[in-house]
Interface confidence: low
């Protein structure tokens, strides 16, 4: 007999064909020989089967000798052997209905675990293979577990259930709640306005929660809370903000913070946390601020940077249109008795300039 796999909640069509392409008498019955539907004259008749309210046939195909039975809103318990009686012959079709569902909410925080559970008819022995949006393959039986969700696991998971050399495909949308970036660094000259942006890697119809930015300045012995805020239906409202620095926050998403001036005392690292309503755990994004200052004091031209810089970054002082005068993998460089002209202080990573500050040295007579 033919085996057909179906998906819980979906629609399935069981086909039954007569040898002659014409309208003829037919009946669909279940394994208990209870009539589900059939034809009487030109009309579809339905029997007392529990399936009757969800079963139908394509009337438009009857005159082609096709007497299919459509079952909508499939349930696991619809798994059965169905019999089509047409032209004094019986055709049997075994229908196996499977369901695949996420055990918890499909909106999960980064690092949380995901469990997919397969519902299957008694007596079946299916195998399940799931593929994440990032191409990760996971196999299992009745359950499939992903211990620690990553940002790239967000999207449609495609799971294939196999039974008797037949397959049925499920698509489950998983949303990993995280910021787009785990960490970001802003490089600014002293006195410049600083913009911090914290875009989310997901969209939700209603987004409500609360957040806070803790800041560890390089020069400070301990961290402090710079700002706390609430998020209600994607609208941002500031609850509390320090007087120094006095951060400003955008009222709409993405979360956006403005520091009026980049100053050496603000250089450091911050951690923005966001707790979402009805979710356990918090979203995190690290943000770093690197500040550059170029100064001339008497015969000394100095360039300094503050904040979290990698040891491989190079700080250089050079006179415009000339080679590097001084270059170090350090946080400060200086030139004694600098030549007159426009000097450039450059913070670079493998030749790529991250931050640049110009200072004019006037001739001393």
């Amino acid at each position: 007999k033919k085996v057909v796999l179906g998906k819980k909640g979906d629609t399935v069509e069981l086909t039954c064909n007569a040898s002659q392409k014409k309208n003829t008498q037919f009946h669909w019955k279940n394994s208990n020989q209870i009539k589900i539907l059939g034809i009487q004259g030109l009309f579809l008749t339905k029997g007392p089967s529990k399936l009757s309210d969800r079963a139908d046939s394509r009337k438009s195909l009857w005159d082609q000798g096709c007497f299919s039975m459509i079952i909508k809103n499939l349930k696991i318990e619809d798994s059965d052997t169905y019999i089509c009686e047409v032209e004094n012959k019986k055709e049997e079709v075994e229908l196996l209905v499977f369901g695949l569902t996420a055990n918890s909410d499909t909106h999960l925080l980064e690092g949380q675990s995901l469990t997919l559970t397969l519902e299957s008819p008694p007596g079946s022995s299916p195998s399940v293979k799931c593929r994440s949006p990032g191409g990760k393959n996971i196999q299992g039986g009745r359950t499939i577990s992903v211990p620690q969700l990553e940002r790239q696991d967000s999207g449609t998971w495609t799971c294939t259930v196999s039974q008797d050399q037949k397959t049925v495909e499920f698509k489950i949308d998983i949303v990993v709640l995280a910021f787009q970036k785990a960490s970001s660094t802003v490089y600014k000259k002293e006195g410049e306005q600083v913009e911090f942006s914290f875009p989310l890697a997901f969209t939700l119809e209603k987004l409500t929660g609360s957040g806070e930015l803790w800041w560890q300045a390089e020069r400070a012995s301990s961290s402090k809370s710079w700002i706390t805020f609430d998020l209600k239906n994607k609208e941002v409202s500031v609850k509390r903000v320090t007087q120094d620095p006095k951060l400003q926050m955008g009222k709409k998403l993405p979360l956006h913070l403005t520091l009026p001036q980049a100053l050496p005392q603000y250089a450091g690292s911050g951690n923005l946390t966001l707790a979402l309503e009805a979710k356990t755990g918090k979203l995190h994004q690290e943000v770093n601020l690197v500040v550059m200052r170029a100064t001339q004091f008497q015969e000394n031209l100095t360039c300094e940077v503050w904040g979290p810089t990698s040891p491989k970054l190079t700080l250089s002082l050079k006179l415009e249109n000339k080679g590097a005068t001084v270059s170090k993998q350090a946080k400060a460089v200086w030139v004694l008795n600098p030549e007159a002209g426009m000097w450039q202080c450059l913070l670079s990573d493998s030749g790529q300039v991250l931050l640049e500050s110009n200072i004019k040295v006037v001739p001393t007579w």
Partner: antibody, heavy 120, light 107 residues
Framework: QVQLQESGPGLVKPSETLSLTCSVS????????WSWIRQPAGKGLEWIGR???????NYNPSLKSRVTMSIDSSKNQFSLKLSSVTAADTAVYYC??????????????WGQGATVTVSS | DIQMTQSPSSLSASVGDRVTITCQAS??????LNWYQQKPGIAPKLLIY???NLETGVPSRFSGSGSGTDFTFTISSLQPEDIATYYC?????????FGQGTRLEIK
Amino acid sequence: QVQLQESGPGLVKPSETLSLTCSVSGGSISTYYWSWIRQPAGKGLEWIGRICTTENTNYNPSLKSRVTMSIDSSKNQFSLKLSSVTAADTAVYYCARDLERLNYYGMDVWGQGATVTVSS
Amino acid sequence: DIQMTQSPSSLSASVGDRVTITCQASQDISNYLNWYQQKPGIAPKLLIYDASNLETGVPSRFSGSGSGTDFTFTISSLQPEDIATYYCQQYDSLPITFGQGTRLEIK
């Protein structure tokens, strides 16, 4: 929710074959029939035919000799080919989902339409 | 093929009016009939299925009735956004066929 998007050349020369593809997103192509309907400018709707994932097809007898439909479940796409076209085949071509349920049959989801002009 | 004949082919009515469109099938199609609305430059939208059932999300001012060969589509109180062309469609037998359409305008 399910969305449909037609794609293919907007201009076809007379006697050549018109080819269009409909991409299904937001849902599986399985279990449903998928139809093609066309509408010449300022005129009514004409059903061309339909296909399902078992590759069962039904074509409008008026076009049957020139129509071929195919389906690719792995790409969530189905296609229409109409051969030996003439200026009379100039129309907006729509793909649509045939939804069947109890006491219900209808084209419940449509693409936005692809304008095809037959001209040399 | 089953022929579907709509009348009138066009009509003009005022906001708030009751509007009626009829559709006649060339043979008995039981209640295998749908009504669609098509606004200019947009794909048709299913309004009524099975001759008289309102599709989910469709305003209740739209209704359908009839069985066999004669069907009626009614807008109880015409709204400006109802300006469109309306089509009946039979699905009793293949090929599926549509009426020629009724263009509805505001006076």
